[in-house]
């Protein structure tokens, strides 16, 4: 019951392999780690098509397979404790050798939401149905089996061997046999590809032992990202069939000599290799050598390239690949730069917007322009910044220091102001008198009149009327007196002096803000302009990225 | 349609054990986790641990290891939950709740632990 | 142990929209918490709502919806009914357990 019948597909710089045999997922990760692999990874279309070919090859060949339904084991899983996260593609599950979750997946139904047990993925496969590249196996979530139970276990698995690179397949001019044996163990006289380290024993002849001549080769690396076998001439030559056996084992062309020899030929744009088989385009682009955006760029007398990269790009140490430059290094922005992919784009930062002298320069914001003012009195512009002052007889109020207050000088903490009776006013106060007494010309004290029944004297008319307009605190006008200790009313209340400075408490916000600011409590967009190259203004993303999508399919998330 | 039938109300001593059920249907047993929650006026809704009965996988809160067991029938769609060395502190109505999403619970089972 | 918070308690109107949230001890709310939200009515009823973060239960109303709005899970009802007077239980999920939140008493008047 271990791993029985294998076959095998390269392409690429991976070869898939498939096994049948009831082993768990753990055993069959560790049967494909033996040999430098893991599980296979399923990450796009492509990839699941070059699965498919190679478990097409398992089942030619496999004829105990007689279930309808066949399932076989790839490198997707969700540990122990993790609970399945339907916002992703991948559900949460993750590749066992690692590397970035894809947008690619092909679930076969919608998935049972757990977090309790480990969860492993397999193909399903439909052995009823011919497998077509229209129809990839869909894959299947459930528990991951048991090692040494193999009625728990399912029908097999697909691992997954990653190369630096692959050599082409021998080509025989005549009759011979070649076989591959690859650094996973694997044996095999047909791939398409061959991997780098792979070993080649070809026998000429066509059978008898007499005539049959052996070759030994090793896949190896040229030159960087060239791979070969190192041999010159086509296999296996027989005069007896010249260009007539596989086309002499040429790639393109067979010249044959009058004598039975021959030699290989190439159409014209292209050159022999030095294995003397292999034709190559004369043109080094043709191969599509440059990545990630290069462009490739033919030397002189078209015989070498050099990769060019679009603007706000460079090229890498491979000198192949585009990465993107940092122009926020050389400092081109008068405040903020942020880097983006193919260009920057400066900004400022808050109180500050973009203008002045030179390409990403800020400027100031007046907060207290005509109009902007988010002061509800006094507003005084600082650079990059502002800060609110209110008029005599008003303090600062409000959560961020923008509003004014009145003042209560009839109940503040500096003692007694009037002599006997004490009135509020919006920004202001006045003293009074009980009756019978009269307001003294200093506004303070009181002094004995002619005896009247009339109200108290002194109480504020109608003269401070509109004095603090603006004030987000209105207040009637109050008298205050205070009892004495005999219960009769005392001369005045407690109250504190009005303040006679008007630029007394002052809110201010720091200059370098990249927070909210303005006047705390008052919220700006960093400004942005100047974006070059690939990149055009725009705003910083706003709204809440994690805010995860909604799904309503009531399926409470069945396995 | 989906239903959690849970076990009747328990009167038991202090230092004795009790086995609560749940039994389900409406639906395939072995396609949720069970999980079981209890409700006390000191601790409000706490997490005692679950089960998945496909495989008999358990997690518990670190809290009830020792003091409460899960497992599950497949034969009789059943879940259980035994729990021992009752105190008073163990008073308290437990819920099962299907799946780790607790769309569905049981009516619950008021444990009562006096001398 | 992590420590999950909700409000004690919200008032809304009929028709209004509300939004309870859930917050972590530990930091901010993931998808990974596979928020979990509950509904208790009188007699002890407990129904499941919104499970693994935005996944609306079996048979719930359209106007419940989940999210993660800033650091915290989310349950909105969007046009509350007098029905959905209620108290309400978020529970997150952290690696092996799930820990629960003190629930959220919502008054529909």
């Known amino acids: 019951t271990g791993a029985d019948t294998e076959a095998v597909v390269c392409v690429g710089t991976a070869c898939y392999t498939a096994h049948s045999g009831k082993l768990s997922a753990a055993e069959a990760q560790n049967h494909c780690n033996q040999n430098g692999g893991n599980l296979a990874t399923v990450k796009s279309k492509e990839e699941a098509q070059h699965v498919q070919r190679v478990l097409a090859q398992l089942l030619r060949r496999e004829a105990a397979l007689t279930a309808r339904m066949s399932k076989f084991w790839i490198g997707l899983q969700r540990e122990k404790g993790k609970c399945l996260d339907p916002s992703l593609p991948l559900k949460g599950f993750s590749w066992v050798g690692g590397g970035e979750d894809t947008p690619y997946s092909n679930w076969h139904k919608e998935l049972r939401n757990s977090c309790i047990s480990k969860r492993c993925v397999s193909l399903l496969l439909d052995l009823s149905q011919p497998l077509l590249p229209s129809r990839l196996p869909k894959w299947s979530e459930g528990p991951c089996g048991s090692p040494g139970s193999p009625g728990s276990n399912i029908e097999g698995f697909v691992c997954k061997f990653s190369f630096k690179g692959m050599c082409r397949p021998l080509a025989l001019g005549g009759p011979g046999q070649v076989t591959y044996t690859t650094p996973f163990q694997t044996t095999s006289s047909s791939l398409e590809a061959v991997p780098f380290a792979s070993a080649a024993n070809v026998a000429c002849g066509e059978g008898d032992k007499d005539e049959t001549q052996s070759h030994y080769f090793l896949c190896k690396e040229k030159a960087p990202d060239v791979f070969d076998w190192g041999s010159s001439g086509p296999l296996c030559v027989s005069p007896k069939y010249g260009c007539n056996f596989n086309n002499g084992g040429c790639h393109q062309d067979c010249f044959e000599g009058g004598d039975g020899s021959f030699l290989c030929g190439c159409r014209p744009g292209f050159r022999l290799l030095d294995d003397l088989v292999t034709c190559a385009s004369r043109n080094p682009c043709s191969s599509s050598p440059c990545r990630g955006g290069a462009t490739c760029v033919l030397g002189p007398h078209g015989k070498n390239y050099t990769c060019r990269c679009p603007q706000g790009y460079q090229l890498d140490s491979s000198q192949l690949d585009c990465v993107d430059v940092d122009e926020c290094q050389d400092s081109p922005c008068a405040q903020e730069c942020v880097n983006t992919p193919g260009g920057f784009r400066c900004e400022c930062w808050v109180g500050y917007e973009p203008g002045g002298p030179g390409e990403g320069a800020c400027q100031d914001v007046d907060e207290c322009a005509l109009g902007r003012s988010p002061c509800a009195q006094g507003c005084t512009n600082t650079d990059g910044s502002f800060h609110c002052s209110c008029e005599e007889g008003y303090v600062l109020a409000g959560e961020d220091g923008t509003q004014c207050q009145d003042v209560d000088e009839c109940v503040g903490p500096g003692g007694p102001l009037c002599d006997s009776l004490c009135f509020n006013t919006q920004g202001s106060f006045h003293c009074g008198c009980l009756p019978g007494w009269v307001l003294a010309p200093n506004g303070v004290s009181c002094t004995m009149g002619p005896v009247s029944l009339g109200p108290p004297s002194g109480p504020p008319d109608e003269e401070d009327k509109g004095e603090k307009e603006g004030s987000t605190v209105p207040r009637a006008a109050t008298a205050s007196p205070t009892r004495g200790p005999e219960g009769t009313p005392k001369a005045t209340p407690t109250t504190s002096r009005p303040s006679l400075s008007s630029d007394a408490p002052i809110t201010s916000a720091p200059l370098k803000m990249l927070a909210p600011s303005g006047s705390p409590g008052v919220w700006r967009e960093p400004s942005i302009h100047h974006a070059t190259a690939a990149s055009g203004p725009q705003e910083p993303a706003g709204g809440d990225s994690s805010v995860a999508t909604q799904n309503n399919d009531g399926t409470d998330g069945q396995k | 349609q989906v239903q959690l039938q849970q076990s009747g109300a328990e009167l038991v001593r202090p230092g004795a054990s009790v086995k609560l059920s749940c039994k389900a249907s409406g639906y395939t047993f072995t396609d949720y986790e069970m999980h079981w929650v209890r409700q006390t006026p000191v601790h409000g809704l706490e997490w005692i641990g679950g089960?998945?009965?496909?495989?008999?996988?358990?997690a518990y809160n670190q809290k009830f290891k020792g003091k409460a067991t899960l497992t599950a029938d497949k034969s009789s769609s059943t879940a259980y939950m035994e729990l021992r060395s009752l105190t008073s502190e163990d008073s308290a109505v437990y819920y099962c709740?299907?799946?780790?999403?607790?769309?569905?619970w049981g009516q619950g089972t008021l444990v009562t632990v006096s001398a | 142990q992590a420590v999950v918070t909700q409000e004690s308690a919200l008032t809304t109107s009929p028709g209004e929209t509300v939004t309870l949230t859930c917050r972590s001890s530990t930091g901010a709310v993931t998808t990974s918490n596979s928020a979990n939200w509950v509904q208790e009515k009188p007699d002890h009823l407990f129904t499941g709502l919104i499970g693994g973060t935005n996944n609306r239960a079996p048979g719930v109303p359209a106007r419940f919806s989940g999210s993660l709005i800033g650091d915290k899970a989310a349950l909105t009802i969007t046009g509350a009914q007098t029905e959905d007077e209620a108290i309400y239980f978020c529970a997150l999920w952290y690696n092996n357990h799930f820990v629960f939140g003190g629930g959220t008493k919502l008054t529909v008047l």
């Open positions: 089960i998945d009965p496909e495989t008999g996988g358990t």
């Open positions: 709740t299907r799946g780790a999403w607790f769309a569905y």
